[in-house]
Interface confidence: low
């Protein structure tokens, strides 16, 4: 059963910059990646960045940088430009659109304990199948 | 610069095990997935299917699946095709080649090995 | 399965004339069709990918158009080294698919 994973890591250096992994873990292959916080695409949640294989990527303030790590694994680096982090509480979802098997989505955050520099592990969790 | 190197010619008699090895260089190996074509004597090319060389997931096109499978050593760059209780009609050039990664299905072979003739007779 | 058909089967032409190769698809496959060119005893070398796009390092004399299901792979003034097996391929869906090749010879 394909899986998706999110890793939500907070930069040592910069407490305000925040770097959100997803990967996708199954047989096919990836036609579309959407990026949300506060909740998945399209259920309350506001879209960051869309990455497309052959198009090219698109993200929106406070996305920085949005790019492919390895034929199944994105990263979306966040700046947060005020005072306080609003990252640190904020649930972020990765949809990945995959041939042949449809959509899926997971949602990973900060772990409340996480110290600069650390990074909360891969973590499966519910996955959402929106075919 | 980015290479593929495949293994030798085989020669094998109906029912055995073959392992054909393609060895990549030059390039981050887990970036790319790897596409298995084979070629009879005189004749096209035959996807076979490809691997996820980062989540090491296979998938076959239908003619062939059952008595072959695709595997990875990543620490040392390699892609595998095994070919079980092999029949006269596997006899053929089999391409290991590089995907472009990214591709929306997976589809644009940049790079292939130089082919390893298999020969099954008995 | 989506079946590619190319034509003609063998093309001879004489160095220095410009000649088309056409790959028709079964079904609309979009722009996602790539040509490979195949010497005898080498593996095949893609020349373009996706219908027109040129890959780094393929001479500017090979440039490729269509979209849906007619695609055509152009060379303008062919050269010696051009000579051999022309495929098609789609990766629309799956299985991926090849078309029978056109063999490109010397008149």
């Known amino acids: 059963t394909p899986e998706v994973w999110v890793q939500v890591q907070m930069e040592a250096t910069e407490l305000s910059s925040f770097t959100v992994h997803c990967g996708f873990l199954g047989p096919g292959s990836i036609s579309l990646v959407t990026v949300s916080w506060g909740g998945p695409d399209g259920a309350g949640g506001t879209k960051l960045a869309v990455l497309h294989p052959e198009l090219g990527t698109r993200q929106w303030a406070p996305a920085r940088q949005a790019r492919w790590e390895t034929q199944s694994s994105i990263s979306l680096a966040l700046e947060d430009s005020g005072a306080s982090s609003p990252f640190a509480n904020t649930t972020f979802c990765c949809k990945f659109a995959s041939f042949p098997e449809g959509s899926w989505e997971s949602c990973g955050s900060l772990p409340p304990s996480s110290d600069p520099g650390l990074s909360a592990p891969p973590t499966p969790v519910p996955i959402l199948r929106a075919d | 610069q980015i290479q593929l190197v495949q293994s030798g010619p085989e020669l094998k008699k109906p029912g055995e095990t073959v392992k054909i090895s393609c060895k990549a260089s030059g390039y981050t190996f887990t970036t790319y997935g790897m596409s298995w074509v084979k070629q009879a004597p005189g004749k096209g090319l035959k996807w076979m299917g490809w691997i996820n060389t980062y989540s090491g997931v296979p998938t076959y096109a239908d003619d062939f699946k059952g008595r072959f499978a695709f595997s990875l050593e990543t620490s040392a760059s390699n892609a595998y095709l095994q070919i079980n209780n092999l029949k006269n009609e596997d006899t053929a050039t089999y391409f290991c080649?590089?995907?472009?990664?990214?591709?929306?299905?997976?589809?644009?072979?940049?790079?292939w090995g130089q082919g390893t003739t298999l020969t099954v007779s008995s | 399965d989506i079946v590619l058909i190319q034509s003609p089967a063998t093309l001879s032409v004489t160095p220095g004339d410009s000649v088309s190769l056409s790959c028709r698809a079964s079904q609309f496959i979009s722009n996602n069709l790539h040509w490979y060119q195949q010497k005898s005893h080498e593996s095949p070398r893609l020349l373009i990918k996706?219908?027109?796009q040129s890959i780094s390092g393929i001479p500017s004399r090979f440039s490729g158009g269509g979209s849906g299901t007619d695609f055509t792979l152009t060379v303008n003034s062919v050269e010696t080294e051009d000579f051999g097996m022309y495929f098609c391929?789609?990766?629309?869906?799956?299985?991926?698919?090849f078309g029978g090749g056109t063999k490109l010879e010397i008149k």
């Open positions: 080649a590089r995907e472009l990664p990214f591709t929306t299905i997976i589809g644009t072979k940049d790079y």
């Open positions: 996706y219908a027109s």
């Open positions: 391929q789609q990766s629309n869906s799956w299985p991926h698919t």
